[in-house]
């Protein structure tokens, strides 16, 4: 659900942290319509997720912790 690198909507699936290698934040005040977390998966897919959802926050926290510990 992305166009010109902007997410236009959110995935209706829940992803497991083992599937995700990283993420980028999309901010609505920086040229895109909505706030989003863009997850980058091991299959080289970009998945747009809702930053308000608990499972999304959990994975972001997990990945952020990983980066801190490197």
């Amino acid at each position: 659900a992305s166009n010109f690198d902007c997410c236009l909507g959110y995935t209706d699936r829940i992803l497991h942290p083992k599937f995700i290698v990283g993420f980028t934040r999309q901010l609505a005040n920086e040229g895109c319509d909505i706030n989003a977390i863009i997850f980058h998966t091991k299959k080289k897919l970009s998945v747009c997720a809702n930053p308000k959802q608990t499972w999304v926050k959990y994975i972001v926290r997990l990945l952020s912790k990983k980066v801190k510990n490197m």
Epitope: L15, H16, K18, T54, W55, Y58
Partner: antibody, heavy 120, light 107 residues
């Protein structure tokens, strides 16, 4: 200790609806997902969907969209699963089960199951 | 959706036997796999999470292994209480699909 206690068995006529409850205790209800899983007679386990009690976000198996509705009442730590337009194929044991991030998204505690029988 | 295929669908064994149940996914699930045990009239019980980790209170005779698309549940020495049906489950991405089950019976 963690407990999930489900409502009792139901017998319903085709076309009717049924609402199964699952009362949670022994943990913080809003910190874990609640999944619903069914097992029809002679069949395997089938994941129906989940609800996140903290924000009421739901995620359904496509097969059960429009058939099942998942809700929670956080004030009583109770999850509900409503099935509509019942058919004989909906006869099954329905389980609520706690989803735990900490055990790799595993379902670590289960209710005792609720048998729903659909018969004319 | 990710399909999960277990083999065998049923298995006869004796107390003390070493038993292996396999589970294959239709695509790589990166170790996002759980195993459950179900006894007649009882709710399922989580045995193994994350393909290899033993859930709380599960005896050490149970072990899980595998990666990619192929996973295994092993019981090193069967006990009478282990006769049950075993299910694998994909948790990589919703919908969380189960294998069709492996029924372990007494020989």
């Amino acid at each position: 200790q963690v407990q999930l206690v489900q409502s009792g068995a139901e017998v319903k006529k085709p076309g009717a609806s049924v609402k199964v409850s699952c009362k949670a205790s022994g943990y913080t209800f809003t910190s874990y997902w609640m999944h619903w899983v069914r097992q029809a007679p002679g069949q395997g386990l089938e994941w129906m969907g989940l609800i996140d009690p903290s924000d009421k976000y739901t995620n359904y198996n496509q097969k059960f969209k429009g058939k099942a509705t998942l809700t929670v009442d956080t004030s009583t730590s109770t999850a509900y699963m409503e099935l509509s337009s019942l058919r004989s194929e909906d006869t099954a044991v329905y389980y609520c089960t706690r989803g735990n991030y900490g055990v790799d998204y595993g379902m670590d505690y289960w209710g005792q199951g609720t048998l729903v029988t659909v018969s004319s | 959706d990710i399909q999960m295929t277990q083999s065998p669908s049923s298995l006869s064994a004796s107390v003390g036997d070493r038993v292996t149940i396999t589970c294959g996914a239709s695509e790589n699930i990166y170790g996002a796999l759980n195993w459950y045990q179900r006894k007649p009239g009882k709710a399922p019980k989580l045995l193994i999470y994350g393909a290899t980790n033993l859930a709380d209170g599960v005896p050490s005779r149970f072990s899980g292994s595998g990666s990619g698309r192929d996973y295994t549940l092993t019981i090193s020495s069967l006990q009478p209480e282990d006769f049950a049906t075993y299910y694998c489950q994909n948790v990589l991405i919703t919908p969380y699909t189960f294998g069709q089950g492996t029924k372990l019976e007494i020989k």
